[in-house]
Amino acid sequence: IINGSDCDMHTQPWQAALLLRPNQLYCGAVLVHPQWLLTAAHCRKKVFRVRLGHYSLSPVYESGQQMFQGVKSIPHPGYSHPGHSNDLMLIKLNRRIRPTKDVRPINVSSHCPSAGTKCLVSGWGTTKSPQVHFPKVLQCLNISVLSQKRCEDAYPRQIDDTMFCAGDKAGRDSCQGDSGGPVVCNGSLQGLVSWGDYPCARPNRPGVYTNLCKFTKWIQETIQANS
């Protein structure tokens, strides 16, 4: 997250970190069910661990943390690397979470976002770009949903209805390491961090997010079929 600020503790209990050994964060994710996460499809890896209820990026033990293995990864059938359409994936955890103030699912919005909607994006991704500098704790950033026209103008021929753009002033954006993390609008999950320009936070080049309102049926049916 570029030019965000430290999230208040306990305010993002659905935020998950996907980790490679040894404790290497590579993507964010979102708890949407007691045993299921949503993340970006491009975050798919064979072996990874899931950390929930953790505030700092470092692997130091926190009393609220819960660690899991991902036992099943189900990318959306419409996703095709290296494209960015349909960029979402469900991850089944090896067990159900223990609900606490630090670990709690969020509902996926069935309403599509309208331009001007105020949202919050969060993650442990780099806070500088193209340099790499990681934060000590989870970062939060207020962003506004942009019209689809502004989105398409920013990225000609690259935008479809499975995506929406959101941003703020130049210099504020999600970035590498934030993929799969939540965009929360009006208390529900509206999007996932997906892609954007490189370096991040360039003027008139907003972040692009997976438009989850288009996928509520697939999410529900996939969880039911695999529970």
């Epitope: 290497q24 991704g125 390491g177 993929s179 892609w195 490189y198």
Partner: antibody, heavy 126, light 107 residues
């Protein structure tokens, strides 16, 4: 078949110019970042330049900054390297290479260069 | 810039030998290291990415390990086709930098 084919190398005098081309086939070129890497005779690999998929980010090795220009034409599936003010130390085999890392995607995961051309030889000599 | 230091610069080995090549970065690069193999007159070939992930089609006798600043490429049982030069490369930070190379020669 995924393939990269370089062309445009040759013998040029110091101070001269040359334009290298790299023709891509067998993959969706516009989705990938690209690099130029060179290898002087009997020496190791030296990264020269990088260009992102949409050309929004470009970078160069200090040794060529201000003299070389990387560009691409996604409609033509082509990568270019314009080399000006050439010096004897630019003599090398020049490779174009596909970058597996998609820096538009916002994961923190880096791969390497998975597809390389056969190389084109540039000789700078009087 | 991040300096990549490879050792040894050359190694003589026989078919069936276990060969280990090391690469050290001048600053931490997490797991973001690639290994390449290059044969004379040919382009480099990606063997390993993210320090330990085997590129598709690469034989399992090749393995990589390490994180931070110290990395290792191991060939568990050297085959005739493995005699070549091997390079490491750090990939997260521009400018990309390669190690100086390790030539694996026939003893």
């Amino acid at each position: 078949e995924v393939q990269l084919v370089e062309s445009g190398g040759g013998l040029v005098q110091p101070g001269g110019s040359l334009r290298l081309s790299c023709a891509a086939s067998g993959f969706t070129f516009e989705h990938y970042s690209m690099n130029w890497v060179r290898q002087a005779p009997g020496k190791g690999l030296e990264w020269v330049s990088y260009i992102s998929s949409s050309s929004s980010y470009i970078d160069y090795a200090d040794s060529v900054k201000g003299r070389f220009t990387i560009s691409r034409d996604n409609a033509k599936n082509s990568l270019y390297l314009q080399m000006n003010s050439l010096r004897a130390e630019d003599t090398a085999v020049y490779y174009c290479a596909r970058d597996l890392t998609d820096r538009q995607s916002r994961d923190y995961y880096y791969y390497g260069m998975d597809v390389w051309g056969q190389g084109t030889t540039v000789t700078v000599s009087s | 810039d991040i300096q990549m230091t490879q050792s040894p610069s050359s190694v003589s080995a026989s078919v069936g030998d276990r060969v280990t090549i090391t690469c050290r970065a001048s600053q931490g690069i997490s797991s973001w290291l690639a290994w390449y193999q290059q044969k004379p007159g040919k382009a480099p070939k990606l063997l390993i990415y993210a320090a330990s992930s085997l590129q598709s089609g690469v034989p399992s006798r090749f393995s990589g390990s390490g994180s931070g600043t110290d990395f290792t490429l191991t060939i568990s049982s050297l085959q005739p086709e493995d005699f070549a030069t091997y390079y490491c490369q750090q990939v997260p930070i521009f400018p990309y930098t390669f190690g100086g190379g390790t030539k694996v020669e026939i003893k």
